[in-house]
Amino acid sequence: TQHGIRLPLRSGLGGAPLGLRLPRETDEEPEEPGRRGSFVEMVDNLRGKSGQGYYVEMTVGSPPQTLNILVDTGSSNFAVGAAPHPFLHRYYQRQLSSTYRDLRKGVYVPYTQGKWEGELGTDLVSIPHGPNVTVRANIAAITESDKFFINGSNWEGILGLAYAEIARPDDSLEPFFDSLVKQTHVPNLFSLQLCGAGFPLNQSEVLASVGGSMIIGGIDHSLYTGSLWYTPIRREWYYEVIIVRVEINGQDLKMDCKEYNYDKSIVDSGTTNLRLPKKVFEAAVKSIKAASSTEKFPDGFWLGEQLVCWQAGTTPWNIFPVISLYLMGEVTNQSFRITILPQQYLRPVEDVATSQDDCYKFAISQSSTGTVMGAVIMEGFYVVFDRARKRIGFAVSACHVHDEFRTAAVEGPFVTLDMEDCGYNIPQTDESTLMT
């Protein structure tokens, strides 16, 4: 899974818009039942916040044991705490489940910092605020971990929603969503609306707060405004996409678009930040600094380490630029752009100064594993993971944080040539792509 600011904290050539509107959301035929419309029972089924992840309530075993599970589109294992741990309020007790089956196989998942290991098995799993189905799914029962669970995060496991190729110990371990689609009539699609608070939350507020929605098997039109724009999933492992152009306040970074996708670009709800390859990060920060040069901030702020505080309600959002990522469109030579505000990439942090302050961390950071469009990007948008049609859709989220002057945006189409050249082809080796 991705490293760096990872949750678990492991916090192109563009052109003028075309005159015509190309087909987008309107070309969808609702060929699967329940694919579109209202999913009232699933709305607001996520809690949490960008710094510690978004979780959904799930039940495991018979009788059902309720656990909060981190929603992670950057990994592919369903793994839950299965032994006492200082940071866990509860854990999966396999011995109490009459439907648990041991696979007699271990699994070990190391990160750059930290790791978890456990024992593989299967059991019956359901999502109370999800589709009304129960599936037998693979479960990694975590028996030992280091720097994986987060104190106070309120989740006890992780739901990896990516593809089998990156499952541990290998791609033969069927991920949860694959099992769900195979065993039920749930369409092969899910969508996420992550709602960043926009202001710090204390512990009691987090426990009581609404974090967003995971719509399993469909798209809920109440969760977004405007149109959905789709970008192809380049390869089914992570949710890999291709970025073709980057702009800061409308100014093109003017880099070879391959740099934006070196060595990949993924959409990952389990990462806090927008993470950018080293060269891209340096260029982006230089541009953001220039755009916000009326105020200077300490070097450590731009490294995502130091916090900057303003008197409550006086954060100068207007001095910080918007950031636009252009994504490959579904039509040849057509792209669209998603634009985020500083309200997304400055992450509110709690309990560090006085109540008279609003304090923030810079939530864009450097990556050695490619671009990671983490929670700070996703909090601006309703994101549709349309696995059936091998594409990811973006629309402006109905819950994104903005001000009276600017809003997040999804716009297009734009003419962009040679977009295929923006993808980076990772050299194939026998070694795991996960250990970087």
């Epitope: 105020e295 200077k296 450590g300 916090l307 304090c359």
Partner: antibody, heavy 120, light 108 residues
Framework: QLQLQESGPGLVKPSETLSLTCTVS??????????WGWIRQPPGKGLEWIGQ???????FYNPSLKSRVTISVDTSKNQFSLKLSSVTAADTAVYYC????????????WGRGTLVTVSS | EIVLTQSPATLSLSPGERATLSCRAS??????LAWFQQKPGQAPRLLIY???NRATGIPARFSGSGSGTDFTLTISSLEPEDFAVYYC??????????FGGGTKVEIK
């Protein structure tokens, strides 16, 4: 080398405005590498940050003093100033001006300080 | 609010002895911590920044260590001019407004 020197009245009456100026010599206040700040120290007590300014005029103030503090900069004179309104005896202190360097994070150079007494 | 607690309040030592001063933060400040020395009637002087880096012109007998919440300033062998008050300051939360209460190092 660069030096900082505070100047201003040593005695201010209660309810009046305390005004101090810090003159930067041996270097330019317009350097993009520094903020310029004010810190005070009541007699026999610890240090309290008042606020800071960048040569462009961008300011940050201590929330507990914000309603009474104004810090300004005059790049033509290579000076920055502090005004603290509605003073009381609790504002009696040695006032220091200082340079905030090392990535705008640390007070790496200080003036000698000037004692301001608030008394009628 | 991050509170810095310095201990001991007073340290009575003789020249040539080793001085160990502590600064504890109420929550993690990473390595964004400075140490200052202040002699009577003088302005504070920056000794250490980023928890362990000596400022320009500071003798090697001064060293800083620690990260997160616990920090130490060590003076390996006290010289007569080292008897003063020492302050820590965190700059993890910026602007850098929080100082510790100080430790006075006095001659025994």
């Amino acid at each position: 080398q660069l030096q900082l020197q505070e100047s201003g009245p040593g005695l201010v009456k209660p309810s009046e405005t305390l005004s101090l100026t810090c003159t930067v010599s041996g270097g330019s206040i317009s350097s993009s590498s520094y903020y310029w700040g004010w810190i005070r120290q009541p007699p026999g007590k610890g240090l309290e940050w008042i606020g800071q300014i960048y040569y462009s005029g961008s300011t940050f103030y201590n929330p507990s003093l914000k309603s009474r503090v104004t810090i300004s900069v005059d790049t033509s004179k290579n000076q920055f100033s502090l005004k603290l309104s509605s003073v009381t005896a609790a504002d009696t202190a040695v006032y220091y001006c200082a340079r905030l360097g090392h990535g705008y994070s640390y007070f790496d150079l200080w003036g000698r300080g000037t004692l301001v007494t608030v008394s009628s | 609010e991050i509170v810095l607690t310095q201990s001991p309040a007073t340290l009575s030592l003789s020249p040539g002895e080793r001085a160990t001063l502590s600064c504890r933060a109420s929550q993690s400040v990473s390595s964004y911590l400075a140490w200052f020395q202040q002699k009577p009637g003088q302005a504070p002087r920056l000794l250490i920044y980023d928890a362990s880096n000596r400022a320009t012109g500071i003798p090697a007998r001064f060293s800083g260590s620690g990260s997160g919440t616990d920090f130490t300033l060590t003076i390996s062998s006290l010289e007569p001019e080292d008897f003063a008050v020492y302050y820590c300051q965190q700059v993890y939360v910026w602007p850098p407004r929080t100082f510790g209460g100080g430790t006075k190092v006095e001659i025994k």
